[in-house]
Amino acid sequence: NEGSVTGSCYCGKRISSDSPPSVQFMNRLRKHLRAYHRCLYYTRFQLLSWSVCGGNKDPWVQELMSCLDLKECGHAYSGIVAHQKHLLPTSPPISQASEGASSDIHTPAQMLLSTLQSTQRPTLPVGSLSSDKELTRPNETTIHTAGHSLAAGPEAGENQKQPEKNAGPTARTSAT
């Protein structure tokens, strides 16, 4: 149904291969990505309330598809912090500002704290962000690919149950 207004291949916005999305726009797409549909010559990405399309061979298109497939996009970001309210109720917001700033080896806070008992409430540094909601934004200076975790999709359980069940108290302390 390519070209159909109502079908899965209808495009709200078409991005030309000649002018790929900016880093900022890509991050916005990553954050709001809900689904994709492979059409004949292009791929349609369904976002929260709109859609965008790009050529099947465009690198940014392949990157976003990979991002959704591997559960690293969409609700993945909000999923990470969704449970901080009851995992770390006494903790201030967590900052992403220092992510990867000085060292190439990345051992996130949840790993540094992984030996703590589930009843303990570690206090993390006060961050520069004002709300949990803002934590859902990826680092806007980098483009990375790899998957998704949508609240109703693969690994929905990871977003909803795993902090308590699977990764202990540190599972969602997702930045240092």
Partner: antibody, heavy 118, light 113 residues
Framework: AVQLVESGGGLVQPKESLKISCAAS????????MNWVRQAPGKGLEWVAR??????????FYADSVKGRFTFSRDDSKSMVYLQMDNLKTEDTAMYYC?????????WGQGTLVTVSA | DIVMTQSPSSLAVSAGETVTINCKSS????????????LAWYQQKPGQSPKLLIY???TRQSGVPDRFIGSGSGTDFTLTISSVQAEDLAIYYC?????????FGGGTKLELK
């Protein structure tokens, strides 16, 4: 060609520590979701741990059986992952496989054997 | 956790036969966001690491002979090996990667009759 090479396994006593490593090549490492899976002698496959990518702040997940004892980390600049295993138990004896989940499939290394015995 | 139930646990075959291994998940592995099933099939021979045969339930890994066919969707999946050869004797595992923790079937041991 995709390659995952584990190292660092060996014989340790209960309650001791061991750090195993995995060197990756042949794919875009920073985009891959990395996991450790183990297999006790003569048994089936058991997932151990997972680490996400940088946009998700390298969030980690652990099997209940290793939670609080194992620590998973990654170094994207070196295409390496590490599994720090503390307070080892005899039931941790297994072949430990490093796996890379990409959109082109799930790649496995040859494994490194960890034996915990008094 | 998603429970993966694999059957049969062992299978005795003769060369040239067609074999079917079943795998059932306790919840659907089909994601509506990309219409993909998060299921993989592996072959493991003694002393070797698992070898990926099929991913996304039906996509054959590069280099895997086309006699290995993955099918199914939702909760019911099948690995079909047509014209079994001696080198196919191994243990076969299904695995879901829809949710953390990843979980595996108990394995199907393919033996020579």
């Amino acid at each position: 060609a995709v390659q995952l090479v584990e190292s660092g396994g060996g014989l340790v006593q209960p309650k001791e520590s061991l750090k195993i490593s995995c060197a990756a090549s042949g794919f875009t490492f920073s985009n891959a979701v990395m996991n450790w899976v183990r297999q006790a002698p003569g048994k089936g496959l058991e997932w151990v741990a997972r680490i996400r990518t940088k946009p998700n702040n390298y969030a980690t997940f652990y099997a209940d059986s290793v939670k609080g004892r194992f620590t998973f980390s990654r170094d994207d600049s070196k295409s390496m992952v590490y599994l720090q295993m503390d307070n080892l138990k005899t039931e941790d004896t297994a072949m430990y496989y490093c796996t890379a989940w990409t959109t082109e499939g799930i790649y496995w290394g040859q494994g490194t054997l960890v034996t915990v015995s008094a | 956790d998603i429970v993966m139930t694999q059957s049969p646990s062992s299978l005795a075959v003769s060369a040239g036969e067609t074999v079917t291994i079943n795998c059932k998940s306790s919840q659907s592995l089909l994601y509506s966001g990309n219409q993909k099933n998060y299921l993989a099939w592996y072959q493991q021979k003694p002393g070797q690491s698992p070898k990926l045969l099929i991913y996304w339930a039906s996509t054959r890994q590069s280099g895997v002979p086309d006699r290995f066919i993955g099918s199914g969707s939702g909760t019911d999946f099948t690995l079909t090996i047509s014209s079994v050869q001696a080198e196919d004797l191994a243990i076969y595992y299904c695995q879901q990667y829809y949710d953390t923790p990843w979980t595996f079937g108990g394995g199907t041991k393919l033996e020579l009759k």
